[in-house]
Interface confidence: low
């Protein structure tokens, strides 16, 4: 059984001039997943990202998240990279509050 994740990218205000961007993957199976932030196509270092563990979401599927802090105005340089069951996709930071994308394979 393979269920592709729903990927949800949100932004929130952090300290002055910075925002926190969070990439959430949910409703996926199996549980092994790669989720990481990239800047200009290059993965950010471990020290600049925070990860949630992969946890069951109550529907027989799983959820997880990764977040990083970036400079406001540089959102277009950042994408969330997701890899699951041999498939992958990239998800930009929304210009507004929320952007929800379904990965279609």
């Amino acid at each position: 059984r393979r269920v592709p994740p729903m990927v949800n990218v949100t932004r929130s205000e952090a300290s002055e001039g910075n925002i926190t961007v969070t990439c959430r993957a949910s409703s996926f199976y199996p549980r092994n997943i790669t989720l990481t932030w990239r800047q200009d196509g290059v993965s950010l270092s471990h020290d600049t990202q925070q990860w949630g563990d992969v946890l069951p979401d109550g529907n027989g599927t799983y959820q997880t998240w990764v977040a990083t802090r970036i400079c406001q105005g540089e959102e277009q340089r950042f994408t969330c990279y997701m890899e699951h069951s041999g498939n992958h996709s990239t998800h930009p930071v929304p210009s507004g509050k929320v952007l929800v994308l379904q990965s279609h394979w």
């Epitope: 790669t34 563990d53 041999g86």
Partner: antibody
Framework: QVQLQESGPGLVKPSETLSLTCTVS????????GHWIRQPPGKGLEWIGM???????DYNAAFISRVTISVDTSKNQFSLKLSSVTAADTAVYYC?????????????WGQGTLVTVSS | EIVLTQSPGTLSLSPGERATLSCTAS???????LHWYQQKPGQAPRLLIY???NLISGIPDRFSGSGSGTDFTLTISRLEPEDFAVYYC?????????FGQGTKLEIK
């Protein structure tokens, strides 16, 4: 500071059950999962299995009929039980933490404990 | 099961030289799930590089990793005496999560 410490009998008789405990400090097992790995004398590393923060376990199919990994988050310990042991199970047994963001690499290890299977 | 084959089995070099250690997977491994460990005699393994090329904090930058698919490499640009040890590659792409048999890096 992150630490893991294996404990348990150093000698187990053939056909009996090997029981080891990994006591962790500097982090919580409600946040990080744990692995068990072993290394026979003079040989390479072999992954036995792991436990996730939600209690879900993943086992190496080579051990699945006789292995159990469990967690006691209140004591910050996770445990390994390996039944029906033979001399081939003689090894140094390590516990390790599942790193966050390291794509499940083992970022901290215990120092290991030697378990000898002999009558 | 993904089999990881490391070569050479033993590498004899002198301090100051460059070491190139190879890890070949029997089937494709996502670069995110290929890691390298160092083990010294009587000690537990230590994570050096995660996800093919990312150096763990505190590891000297003379260590580097590269590769994709089935072929991965650990390089030590200029060997220091403390680098002589056994190195293992490890994949977490598919269960069971396997290790290579190790490359022993010894002083020539």
């Amino acid at each position: 500071q992150v630490q893991l410490q294996e404990s348990g009998p150093g000698l187990v008789k053939p056909s009996e059950t090997l029981s080891l405990t990994c006591t962790v400090s500097g982090f919580s097992l409600t946040t990080y999962g744990g692995h068990w790995i072993r290394q026979p004398p003079g040989k390479g590393l072999e992954w036995i299995g792991m436990i996730w923060t939600d209690g879900w376990t993943d086992y190496n199919a080579a051990f699945i009929s006789r292995v159990t990994i469990s967690v006691d988050t209140s004591k910050n310990q996770f445990s390994l039980k390996l039944s029906s042991v033979t001399a081939a199970d003689t090894a140094v047994y390590y516990c390790a933490r599942k790193g966050h963001g390291y794509y499940y690499a083992m970022d901290y290890w215990g120092q290991g404990t030697l378990v000898t299977v002999s009558s | 099961e993904i089999v990881l084959t490391q070569s050479p089995g033993t590498l004899s070099l002198s301090p100051g030289e460059r070491a190139t250690l190879s890890c070949t997977a029997s089937s494709s491994v996502s670069s995110s799930y290929l890691h390298w460990y160092q083990q010294k005699p009587g000690q537990a393994p230590r994570l050096l590089i995660y996800s093919t090329s990312n150096l763990i904090s505190g590891i000297p930058d003379r260590f580097s990793g590269s590769g994709s698919g089935t072929d991965f490499t650990l390089t030590i640009s200029r060997l220091e005496p403390e680098d002589f040890a056994v190195y293992y590659c490890h994949q977490y792409h598919r269960s069971p999560f396997t290790f290579g048999q190790g490359t022993k890096l010894e002083i020539k």
